[in-house]
């Protein structure tokens, strides 16, 4: 007798590993024999699809090599024309051993920054990810965390974080290990022991001692008054990432000695500096009201004008001499924007050397004033018209209130380079000689108050005056 189809063994959930075989069984009793069709996620599986094998009159569906994309709901439908079609469904869960799809890589990181070591995984059930540092499991803390993605994040990296790391992905089917990678922690150069200042007698030997550390180990260089040390012997030793440098000097003049520790991080360098003054007892007679100290110029405004690493006098009448003197120059330079192209560089050179005077680092640090001749060259040659206007404005109080703080130098009160060549400072930017001066028309009603000498030429000068310039 005809009999409608009945599925005697309903489909069950099948767990299968990737690349293995998975079979669904759909046993049907009916008469006549039914037609059995299969669907995956409601899409018909074609009989000729070579990834599947359908046997036993359609009652067995075999996936020949499971892929992770095969998971889903599989249904068999039996129909023989008697009664209605019947259906049974079951799920395929593709199980997968852990696999590390994005393994960690070697990392170099600067101390204090954030490091992230990637470890992206696949697997079903979802693998749990842990990390091993050296030979021990890595413990998470407020700085160190394993992210949801499996990556390891280390905030505020410390020296002790350096070492060998690997990630471990684990689920019920197995465990996968990444290759071992290296986290290298680099540390900015830092001075541990700064050289000490000394007040010594002329002709003494002094040893300056500077110790620095960093990863990689820094190199130490010594600077004397802004230039590489030309004399003296340097001894160096390195132990446990600490470099020790000793500079032995024979003292014949005062100076500012700077120890500079430098190390490299990729393309960038980090430096640390410490300075010491060597003064000679009885070297300079203290000048009245010269309260201040010598320091290397490290501002911006006068960079192009002052010698590199120039030793300048910082006046402690100001609460913050560096800032105050820098900003007074800046204010004045804004006033200079309107002056002629002949005057401006000369005035800038005068201004910078007047506010940031060269410094003699004796027992009492002493500012070295500009030589009278250079001041007069600016006043009566380069900036004759402008100087007259400026003096008039100052007398009439037309400048903004801080301009009087600048106190434009009175040339006549400055020492002459003829009296004592070491008692005053030259302006190397004024690169001209007497021959050039003869081509200028008279600037003022009277001759310059002193003979302007042949000023020493300077190859690094930023401008020169030639007969083609006119100041009228």
């Amino acid at each position: 007798l005809p009999k409608a189809p009945v599925i005697t063994t309903p489909l069950e959930t099948v767990d299968a590993l990737v690349e293995e075989v998975a079979t669904f069984m759909c046993a049907v009793e009916s008469y006549p024999q039914p037609e059995i069709s299969w669907t995956r996620n409601k899409i018909l599986i074609k009989l000729f699809d070579t990834r599947y094998s359908i046997r036993e009159n359609g009652q067995l569906l075999t996936i020949l090599s499971v892929e992770d994309s095969d998971d889903g709901i599989y249904c068999c439908t039996a129909n023989n024309g008697v009664g209605g079609a019947v259906e049974s469904c079951g799920a395929l869960q593709v199980k997968m051993k852990p696999k590390i799809t994005r393994p960690p890589i070697n990392v170099k990181i600067i101390e204090g920054l954030k490091a992230v070591l990637p470890c992206t995984t696949m697997g079903n059930p979802k693998p749990s990810v842990s990390w091993i540092k050296g030979d021990s499991p890595l413990r998470e803390n407020s700085r160190i965390a394993v992210l949801e993605s499996g990556s390891l994040r280390i905030h505020n990296v410390q020296k002790e974080d350096a070492g060998q790391y690997r990630c471990v992905a684990k689920n019920s089917l197995g465990t996968a290990y990444s290759k071992v990678v290296k986290l290298e922690v680099e540390v900015f150069a830092r001075i541990l022991r700064a050289p000490e200042s000394h007040n010594v007698t002329f002709g003494s030997f002094v040893t300056l001692h500077c110790t620095a550390t960093g990863i990689p180990v820094p190199t130490i260089t010594w600077i004397e008054n802004g230039n590489a040390v030309s004399s003296g012997s340097i001894q160096e030793s390195v132990k446990d990432r600490v470099i020790d440098s000793r500079l032995q000097l024979f003292i014949t003049k005062p100076g500012l000695y700077t120890c500079i520790a430098t190390n490299k991080h990729g393309e960038k360098f980090s430096t640390a500096k410490a300075a010491a003054t060597i003064s000679i007892a009885e070297w300079s007679k203290p000048q009245k009201d010269n309260k201040g100290y010598c320091a290397q110029y490290r501002g911006e405004v006068c960079n192009a004008v002052l010698a590199k690493d120039a030793l300048v006098f910082l006046n402690t009448s100001y609460a913050d001499p560096e800032e105050a003197q820098e900003l007074l120059v800046h204010t004045a330079w804004n006033e200079l924007k309107v002056v002629s192209p002949v005057c401006r560089p000369a005035a800038e050179a005068l201004l910078c050397n007047h506010i940031f005077q060269e410094c003699s680092p004796g027992v009492v640090p002493t500012p070295i004033p500009i030589c009278r001749e250079y001041c007069l060259a600016v006043k009566e040659l380069f900036c004759a018209k402008e100087w007259l206007v400026m003096e008039e404005k100052t007398h009439r109080g037309l400048y903004r209130s801080e301009m009087h703080l600048l106190s434009v130098p009175e040339c006549s009160k400055l020492p002459s380079m003829h009296w004592d060549p070491t008692a005053c400072a030259r302006l190397p930017h004024l690169d001209y000689n007497k021959e050039n001066l003869k081509t200028f028309p008279p600037m003022t009603s009277s001759k310059p108050s002193v003979d302007i000498p042949n000023l020493p030429s300077s190859s690094s000068s930023s401008f020169s005056v030639s007969p083609t310039y006119s100041m009228t």
Epitope: A272, A275, A295, A319, D320, E323, S401, E402, H404
Partner: antibody, heavy 124, light 107 residues
Framework: EVQLVESGGGLVQPGGSLRLSCAAS????????IHWVRQAPGKGLEWVAS????????SYADSVKGRFTISADTSKNTAYLQMNSLRAEDTAVYYC?????????????????WGQGTLVTVSS | DIQMTQSPSSLSASVGDRVTITCRAS??????VAWYQQKPGKAPKLLIY???SLYSGVPSRFSGSRSGTDFTLTISSLQPEDFATYYC?????????FGQGTKVEIK
């Protein structure tokens, strides 16, 4: 993150000494000056001393000159205020504050970060 | 020493008011003036530096200005969290000096 943390305050007898510390983190010590500012109970702010760590140049208010010494250990990023011959009028909350050099700004900088303060009480 | 004379020493105002505090320097201090806000039991906070530059993170209702040796802090529309003591400071000349403070209270 920039932080200044003072410590070392407490109760001391007149004529006694205390050493205050100001531990700095999150910035380059050598690009800053460190200042101590105090505030007596119910009063205003009074600047006490400063140090420019790059040059170790120091300055002091007249009221503390000769009694207080400011210093810095750049390797530890810490500034100190050694207070000797303390007087009742030195009783105050002592703050350390930093001033950072920003040359390209061409502006006078203020004290942009302050510590939480440490109380110094001078009393017999 | 440079005197920074701050006025008024205290004021009462309501939320939404425009508040002005002035400071006069006894001699030229260029633009080296900063303004700070201090709440009871807390450290001062920088509001304005270089006379008129707003410090980062400070609301734009605060502004500073300068006219010669007179400096002004203005709060354009007072908010509840602005009730505090305000100090001016000059940092050009040694020693650094502060104004005596202005306490802004709720009316």
């Amino acid at each position: 993150e920039v932080q200044l943390v003072e410590s070392g305050g407490g109760l001391v007898q007149p004529g006694g000494s205390l050493r205050l510390s100001c531990a700095a983190s999150g910035f380059t010590f050598s690009s800053s000056s460190i200042h101590w500012v105090r505030q007596a109970p119910g009063k205003g702010l009074e600047w006490v001393a400063s140090i420019s760590s790059s040059y170790s140049s120091t300055s002091y208010a007249d009221s503390v000159k000769g009694r207080f010494t400011i210093s810095a250990d750049t390797s530890k990023n810490t500034a100190y205020l050694q207070m000797n011959s303390l007087r009742a009028e030195d009783t105050a909350v002592y703050y350390c504050a930093r001033k950072y050099y920003r040359w390209r700004h061409n502006k006078y900088q203020g004290f942009d970060y302050w510590g939480q303060g440490t109380l110094v009480t001078v009393s017999s | 020493d440079i005197q920074m004379t701050q006025s008024p020493s205290s004021l009462s105002a309501s939320v939404g008011d425009r508040v002005t505090i002035t400071c006069r320097a006894s001699q030229s201090v260029s633009s080296a003036v900063a303004w700070y806000q201090q709440k009871p039991g807390k450290a001062p906070k920088l509001l304005i530096y270089s006379a008129s530059s707003l410090y980062s993170g400070v609301p734009s209702r605060f502004s500073g200005s300068r006219s010669g040796t007179d400096f002004t802090l203005t709060i354009s529309s007072l908010q509840p969290e602005d009730f505090a003591t305000y100090y001016c400071q000059q940092s050009l000349w040694y020693p650094v000096t502060f104004g005596q403070g202005t306490k802004v209270e709720i009316k």
